[in-house]
Structures are given as C-alpha cells and as structure tokens.
C-alpha cells in the first residue's frame, strides 16, 4: 500500500517546510484516497468488463450510494459551507459500510482496499474537527449496516463484481465533488 499522506519522500526531503494547515491536510488526504481508488479500479477493470458498461446501464441498481444533490449546498449554485460540510461527513459515514464490503473483494490490492478504508476514517475525523454543526450529522444505524453487508455478500459473483465497480465509481465521484467544494471553503 502507498505511504499515508505526510510521510511521502517529498515530505522527508523538506524537513523545514511549514506544517500543513487543516485544509491542506484534508486536501492531501482526499487525493491519497483517490489514488487508492484508482488502483482498486484498475484491478476491477482488469478482472471484469464492468468498466465498459454505460453509466445508464449501471444506474439500474438498488444500491443507495451517497450522491451529491443541489440541495446539499456543495455546488456553485446554492453553495453553503455548513450544509455542504454536513453532507460530506454524512456521506462518508454512509460509505463506510460499502468500504467494509470491499475488504474481501481484492486479491492483489487487498492492502490498498484496507488503506482506502482506514484513510476514510481519518478523513472523517479531520472533517468533524472542521464542522461547527456536528448535531446535524446523522450516523448510520449499525444494525441496518450489518444486514446490508450480509445482503451484499450473499449476491452472486456477477452482482458482486457490479457492486464493487459501482461503489468505487460512486465513491470517487463523491470525493471529487467534496474536494471541489472544500477548495471553495
């Protein structure tokens, strides 16, 4: 697995550099997770032909993956820093069960899948420190998550491949939208 942010060779080579600000740390953390997703997508795409499927075909699924909408305040029209931050944190918490599902889905990238999961937990902590309105953040119900995980793991091989692909693609899009919004804050 790649070295976590803050420990790469560039950082070692520049010991006198200013410490990262909270925003820079979050930015770097998200880019690190995106790199991990990219590596996982490579393995998924090499293994199955899911990546060639059109977005429309893949949209016909019963996964309730977090997605940014206009009302969430993360797009330029209707941009709202606090509403958006709540959506980002809530969405990441909702993705956690899907990241757990990914843990046994990779052969050569098992460590990478773990790194994405653990880095997301760290990212959530970073963002919670930034948020003023923590009360507005709803945490997913563990029992519901457990039954969802069981249901996903009971799918046939083709559906599991499809689910893996959809999770990675949706998580990537969610992180990209989140980071673009965070760069406005």
């Amino acid at each position: 697995a790649p070295v976590p942010p803050g420990e790469d060779s560039k950082d070692v080579a520049a010991p006198h550099r200013q410490p990262l600000t909270s925003s820079e740390r979050i930015d770097k953390q998200i880019r690190y997770i995106l790199d991990g997703i990219s590596a996982l997508r490579k393995e998924t795409c090499n293994k199955s032909n899911m990546c060639e499927s059109s977005k429309e075909a893949l949209a016909e699924n019963n996964l309730n993956l977090p997605k940014m909408a206009e009302k969430d305040g993360c797009f330029q029209s209707g941009f709202n820093e606090e509403t958006c931050l709540v959506k980002i944190i809530t969405g990441l918490l909702e993705f956690e069960v899907y990241l757990e599902y990914l843990q046994n889905r990779f052969e050569s990238s098992e460590e990478q899948a773990r790194a994405v999961q653990m880095s997301t937990k760290v990212l959530i902590q970073f963002l919670q420190k930034k948020a003023k309105n923590l009360d507005a953040i709803t945490t997913p119900d563990p029992t519901t998550n457990a039954s969802l995980l069981t249901k996903l793991q009971a799918q046939n091989q083709w559906l599991q491949d499809m689910t893996t692909h959809l999770i990675l693609r949706s998580f990537k899009e969610f992180l990209q939208s989140s980071l673009r919004a965070l760069r406005q804050m």
Epitope: R31, L34, F75, Q76, K172, Q176, L179, R180
Partner: nanobody, 123 residues
C-alpha cells in the same frame, strides 16, 4: 501528464462572442478536470472556470452568465464559449488540467498547462 493546445483566440469587438478550444493528448482526457485561467497585461493569472470529471462546473463571478465551459470527451476537447465580451476580458487564456478530476480556483491544483491563446476585446 497531458499536453494541451489552445485555439480560437483573436480580436473581437465589445459585445461580441468567441469560442476557445483546448485539445488534449497523452492522457485519459475524460478523467481530468479541465479549467480556463486568464492573464491580463501586468496582472496575475486568474481563474475563469472549470469542469470536473463528472461534469460539475464553477465560474468566477466576473464571467458568470456570460461564459460557458463544456467538454467533449470523445474529441479530447474542452471549450469556452464567451459571450457579451468586454474590454476587461482582454487577456491570454490558458487551459489547465487536473489529473485528480477535481479542479479548483487556484493554479496549484493543476498539473498540466497549455501555452495560451490571446483574446483582445476592443471598445
């Protein structure tokens, strides 16, 4: 990294329109966020607009409602449609790409840049 080449600049009268194009080669274009920046004589380079991998767009307040960014992934090209041009839009326009597909309003978010194309708006 991708190589970027801008085109479509020129001289236009105030109130007129221009469409800039930026064609990319050497990367998976559809996975990049693309942006336009501009630099007027004697000024810093400034953000104009960007479009993310999934199509979300952001605009600088000064161009909102007049400029439109779009992309054609099949042609590896991003466009900037500029309407109701003003003399203060005169600048060299640069295309930039972010390999993370995110974009942002600062130069540091982009890892590839074009050479720029001159846009002059006369009054």
């Amino acid at each position: 990294q991708v190589q970027l080449v801008e085109s479509g600049g020129g001289l236009v009268q105030a109130g007129g329109s221009l469409r800039l194009s930026c064609t990319a080669s050497g990367g998976t274009f559809g996975e990049y966020a693309m942006a336009w920046f501009r630099q007027a004589p004697g000024k810093e380079r400034e953000f104009v607009t960007d479009i993310g991998e999934s199509g979300g767009t952001w605009y600088a307040d000064s161009v909102k409602g007049r400029f439109t960014i779009s992309r054609d992934n099949a042609k590896n090209t991003v466009y900037l449609q500029m309407n109701s041009l003003r003399p203060e839009d005169t600048a060299v326009y640069y295309c930039a790409a972010d390999s993370y597909g995110v974009g942002g309003g600062a130069e540091r978010y982009y890892d590839s840049w074009g050479q720029g194309t001159q846009v002059t708006v006369s009054s």
